[in-house]
């Protein structure tokens, strides 16, 4: 495969007002409900490394681990927000189905690997924090993807 | 060590026109996203627009919108902001800012020494 | 455009602590995680000294620190020293994926 295969999603998924607003609602019920504010999971430590290039990619994983480890397991919190933002993120997961990197991922399994050992570590508080921090993952899949 | 330096600033007419240009060296300049900001003579900051790593996302301050565009050249390491249609209240110190670390172009980390546009007839 | 507003001036003593607020609408500062501040002298360039809410560059004093609470971010100065003497902005993203900034704070160190 040639490097950042479908790597892309269109910049339309960012330009619907409505679930932007949904998005960044259910992060900021989420953040409410986070006492741990010192870490943070999507920032500096989580592209370190990364080539932006790559960072589709890098995205692309901490979406599905998302989806499956985290709303998934609470997926009865945080509504009306939840039943609507997670089909969305879904969408954007199929989107990406597609994308692969060649030549050495290792950086990126590594910092995704940190990301989702700090999730576990911190148990259900671990998964209020990564709902609290969708805003992140939405900012980062368009800045990274479009 | 990260440098970025704006050109192309100015005295212009309002309705007028002018192409500012940020070179930037001392880093990969496409793992960055990139920003303009601007600070009116004895005013505060205002962003102005910014831009993903490779041009696809371009965002602008309703301020300005539709009037200016921000591009990029990754080959040159260059950013730019054309800027049309210009208003008294455009005159500002225009500074080129990256984002801190890659993949958060809000977080300004570095930031040029700024061009002057003076915006009178 | 979303404003976010800071105090226009803030004093102290050498050692003090001083506390700056940027306070902004639930589609400002209260609904995301992007709160930076920026420390600008007199006719320099704007310094990034807080980034991701409470995250310090490499270089600059621990004795800065930020906080976000509801929709109020803050910006803590301690053991206050002369050449804190600035002007302070925050700033955030908002909604439509622009950045705004407060209005900017004048910090004055007395004596």
């Known amino acids: 495969l040639p490097v950042n295969t479908r790597c892309k999603l269109e910049v339309s998924n960012f330009q619907q007002p409505y679930i932007v607003n949904r998005t960044f609602m259910l992060a900021k019920e989420a953040s409410l409900a986070d006492n741990n504010t010192d870490v943070r999971l999507i920032g500096e430590k989580l592209f370190r490394g990364v080539s932006a290039k790559d960072q589709c990619y890098l995205m692309k994983q901490v979406l599905n681990f998302t989806l499956e480890d985290v709303l998934l397991p609470q997926s009865d919190r945080f509504q009306p927000y939840m039943q609507e933002v997670v089909p969305f993120l879904t969408k954007l997961s199929n989107q990406l189905s597609s994308c692969h990197i060649s030549g050495d991922d290792q950086n990126i399994q590594k910092n995704v690997r940190r990301l989702k050992e700090t999730v576990k570590k911190l148990g259900e508080s671990g998964e209020i924090k990564a709902i609290g921090e969708l805003d992140l993952l939405f900012m980062s899949l368009r800045n990274a993807c479009v | 060590e990260v440098q970025l330096v704006e050109s192309g600033g100015g005295v212009v007419r309002p309705g007028g026109s002018l192409r500012l240009s940020c070179a930037a060296s001392?880093?990969?300049?496409?793992?960055?996203?990139m920003n303009w900001v601007r600070q009116a003579p004895g005013k505060g900051l205002e962003w102005v627009s910014g831009v993903n790593w490779n041009g696809g996302t371009r965002d602008y301050a309703a301020s300005v919108k539709g009037r200016f565009t921000i591009s990029r050249d990754n080959a040159k390491n260059s950013l730019y902001l054309q800027m049309n249609s210009l208003r008294a209240e455009d005159t500002a110190l225009y500074y080129c800012?990256?984002?801190?670390?890659?993949?958060?172009?809000?977080?300004?980390?570095?930031w040029g020494r700024g061009t002057l546009v003076t915006v009178s007839s | 455009q979303a404003v976010l507003t800071q105090p226009s001036s803030v004093s102290g003593s050498p050692g003090q602590s001083i506390t700056i607020s940027c306070t902004g609408a639930s589609g400002d500062v209260g609904a995301y995680n992007f709160v930076s501040w920026y420390q600008q002298h007199p006719g320099k360039t704007p310094k990034l000294i807080i980034y991701d809410v409470n995250k310090r560059p490499s270089g600059v004093s621990n004795r800065f620190s930020g906080s976000k609470s509801g929709n109020t971010a803050s910006l803590t100065i301690s053991g206050l020293q002369a050449e804190d003497e600035s002007d302070y902005y925050c700033a955030s993203l908002v909604s439509d994926f622009s950045v705004v900034f407060g209005g900017g704070t004048k910090v004055t160190v007395l004596g």
């Open positions: 001392g880093f990969t300049f496409d793992d960055y996203g």
């Open positions: 800012a990256r984002g801190w670390y890659s993949g958060a172009a809000w977080n300004m980390g570095y």
